[in-house]
Interface confidence: low
């Protein structure tokens, strides 16, 4: 709800390059970058290679033209370069930039992959689409490190083992592990390649049952998180073709044996839903353990609306399905094609997530924002970002999403979304969130036996009503304007009945008070009112509810940023509820005990008159 769709930072890539198929927010020292995968681009650094794809870096600040430049991966201009004893590379159509991931630390490196990279050493027998990944240094400058996790010397069979593994179709980076999905291994049973950077060894998946489930595409999506314990890292892999319905596995990375051991699995619910084709590990409820979101973008009630299943971690890797999210359930939306953790977008202490539906609105695309809370995830999305509304040129907006990094320096993480069919990427900046604390002070009860006020004609029962407001938040302005409406006896009004009390202000009677306040940061401002009780009130049992509804007035001032225009704050979302505060009081019952039971006796007599 606090992302600003009105001032998108738009980066445009080369035409028909699929620029935006993958996106990644990155920082090095004080520089913020949007990294973009364009897997069908030509590379200026390898002009003789046919459309190998490229990774572009787009500087966020001091880049008025929103220019993006290709990253030089120092891979040379030549074709057919030797890459091992029995390895010669063919980079034509390799799809560099199909996936991007960042190591989660200050000088974090970047993983960029090309899953269609081929080893053509055994050209006469088989062209082997092993897939290729590259670890790029944090400064995006120096030469990085090449990974071909499926290459093994003298192995030349296509389907067997890792011949056609296509590693890197998905990638994930932890502080120590590089996780690469390889869905083509073992006749497309698929596997996950996990490189431990500390000892430079690969963890192996030796689970025979999984390895023999051909054509399941394990590794089509990968992630990692703290599932079994807050201090251990476990690896997650999606197998979207498993039994036609899809499956997700969590593996413990066992350092001693150097293997991945299955600790959890869950299956999809509908044939062809592609359950497991997108994954997101995020601690939604702040308990130190990762929860899991699993996308099934082709889940259909009518056609491919898509669905995301949320699993909450109950400890020791035992995950419990909380609910399924569907966004707006739009026709052919592919909701769940991408899922990204956004860190704490609105500064409420819980992480938030974005879910892409890139085919919604006839391929324009949309992104939905959901919020974590103590119970897991808030089922109602707080915001829908429509590609069409952000910029009508956008196509497949939401195919890729990256978040969690404050790109504009206002203290809130921002969100970057790719729209590869229009070769576009959009950075959406987060607005500061204002929390308004509202108190309504009322008497414990209203004395209706001894009127304390006068309405100009006769004594009336009355009560004092005081409202107090203050506000706080991270990186919010020092002063704000607040519009508020104080309503009396709202429960009656909501039922279409006449309120029993009314305000008296400067001799005028009114059912509600509307005011505009100028508030200063962390300073309480109060207003005092007198409310009169109507004469001959019949209902003296039900409580009288007062409600203060409030909104920011137009003249809110945001802090100025140097390069990017300032964004004004928003009020904290109330999980879909009205932004208002209520309090209630009751009519004094004048009973000896609180439990006021009626002692009534009725006698009836039937009187009939003959006509």
């Amino acid at each position: 709800y606090n992302l600003d769709p009105q001032r998108p930072v738009h980066f445009q890539g080369p035409a028909d390059s699929f620029f935006g198929y993958a996106v990644l927010e990155h920082f090095h020292d004080n520089t913020r970058w949007v990294l973009v995968g364009a897997p069908k681009a030509d590379s200026k650094y390898s002009p003789s290679v046919k459309s190998p794809g490229a990774v572009f870096k787009c500087r966020v600040h001091t880049n008025p033209d929103r220019r993006c430049t290709e990253l030089d991966m120092a891979r040379g201009k030549n074709r057919g370069t030797s890459c091992g004893k029995t390895c010669r590379e063919d980079r034509d159509d390799e799809w560099m930039g199909v996936s991007l991931a960042r190591q989660p630390k200050a000088d974090g490196r970047v993983l960029a992959c090309a899953h269609r990279w081929k080893n053509i050493y055994y050209e006469a027998d088989h062209i082997l689409p092993h897939g290729f990944c590259y670890i790029i240094p944090s400064n995006l400058q120096a030469k990085g490190r090449t990974l071909i996790p499926c290459y093994e010397e003298y192995k030349k069979k296509y389907g067997e083992e890792h011949g056609s593994c296509q590693a890197g179709i998905a990638g994930f980076f932890t502080e120590e592990l590089v996780v690469m999905g390889a869905p083509g291994s073992f006749y497309w049973a698929g596997t996950i390649k996990v490189l431990n950077l500390t000892d430079n060894t690969y963890l192996k998946l030796n689970d025979e049952v999984i390895m023999n489930r051909r054509y399941t595409y394990l590794g089509y999506a990968v992630t990692a998180g703290h599932f079994s314990h807050p201090s251990t890292i476990d690896v997650v892999g999606g197998a979207p073709q498993d039994k036609g319905i899809g499956k997700v596995y969590i593996f413990r990375a066992d350092r001693r044996s150097g293997t991945l051991i299955k600790i959890f699995q869950a299956s999809g619910k509908k044939m062809g839903s592609y359950f497991g084709s997108s994954l997101c590990a995020v601690d939604l409820n702040g308990d130190g353990l990762s929860d899991l979101l699993v996308g099934a973008p082709m889940f259909s009630e009518i056609r491919d609306e898509g669905q995301v299943t949320v699993y909450i971690n109950r400890g020791n890797g035992a995950l419990e399905e909380q609910l399924a999210l569907t966004g707006d359930g739009a026709y052919n939306a592919h909701f769940g094609e991408s899922i990204a953790s956004l860190d704490d977008l609105d500064n409420d202490g819980f992480p938030d997530v974005a879910i892409g539906a890139p085919k919604e609105d006839d391929f324009a695309g949309a992104v939905y924002i959901y919020h974590g809370d103590a119970g897991g995830i808030v089922p109602q999305y707080s915001m829908k970002l429509s590609g069409q509304k952000i910029n009508p040129v956008l196509r497949m907006f939401g195919q890729s999403i990256s978040g969690g990094i404050d790109m504009d320096g206002n203290g809130y993480p921002d969100v970057t979304v790719g729209a590869f069919m229009s070769d576009s990427v959009v950075l959406l900046r987060a607005r500061p969130v204002i929390t308004v604390d509202v108190s309504i002070f009322l008497p414990g009860s209203i004395n209706i036996t001894a009127p304390q006020c006068h309405d100009g004609q006769q004594p009336v029962n009355c009560l004092n009503v005081t409202t107090c407001f203050s506000f706080h938040g991270k990186h919010v302005p020092g002063e704000i304007g607040l519009n508020y409406v104080l309503m009396a006896d709202v429960a009656k009004k909501e039922k279409g009945q006449m309120p029993r009390v009314y305000f008296v202000l400067l001799g005028e009677t009114m059912g509600q008070v509307t005011e505009k306040l100028q508030l200063t940061y962390m300073e309480e401002t109060c207003r005092h009112y007198v409310a009169h009780v109507k004469r001959r009130v019949q209902d003296v049992i039900s409580p009288i509810v007062f409600e203060a509804a409030y909104s920011l007035s137009e003249h809110v001032t945001g802090e100025e940023e140097r390069e990017l225009p300032p964004l004004t704050p928003v009020l904290r979302w109330k999980k879909g509820q009205k932004i208002a505060q209520k309090n209630q009081t009751v009519f004094e019952r004048n009973c000896r005990s609180e439990d006021c039971a009626a002692d009534l006796q009725l006698q009836g007599k039937l009187l009939l008159s003959s006509m």
């Epitope: 001032r7 929103r66 809110v556 001032t557 225009p565 300032p566």
Partner: antibody, heavy 122, light 107 residues
Amino acid sequence: QVQLQQSGPELVKPGASVKISCKASGYSFTSYYMNWVKKRPGQGLEWIGWIFPGSGNTKYNEKFKGKATLTADTSSSTAYMQVSSLTSEDSAVYFCARSWVSYERGYYFDYWGQGTSLTVSS
Amino acid sequence: DIQMTQSPASLAASVGETVTLTCRASENIYYSLAWYQQKQGKSPQLLIYNANSLEDGVPSRFSGSGSGTQYSMKINSMQPEDTATYFCKQAYDVPYTFGGGTKLEIK
């Protein structure tokens, strides 16, 4: 209604300084930005800078840093601009204009003063 | 600084004629554009903000459009009281910069 009343015309000698005032009424002075704009005969408009009276924060166009100083007196709801080391290049009409930062409106100047004519001549 | 280039510099139009003024920014200003009208001897008046939003009280014959770096303002049926100089201004980044102005007169 909102009004911005500027001080009268000034004839000043080169090298001197001048202080132009802009008295605001009809709105909350501390809640809006007060901008100053320069208009030379036959030329376009130039934004000099703004002051936010509520906090005293200022933002200047680099071109006018050291030339113009913006201040505000909240008790009298008056904004001031002092222009120093005057030369003939400073001869112009100077406007004050109200604006605010808003999600809907950005930095747009919705009310303007009537302008103060400054002539620098020996 | 963002440069704003306005055209034409001057224009004469008949009453009832449709007039279009254009403004080009040196970089994308993402709809953060205003149009102001300044009549002889008066202070400027805000007509259009956010590229296409009409300020309260401005006649509906004025309209704004555009995106990216190219923006325009249209006066649907020129009236004698529309004789003035019109300025565009970018509100995207500091320093806020104005176009050179278009002087519009009655033919």
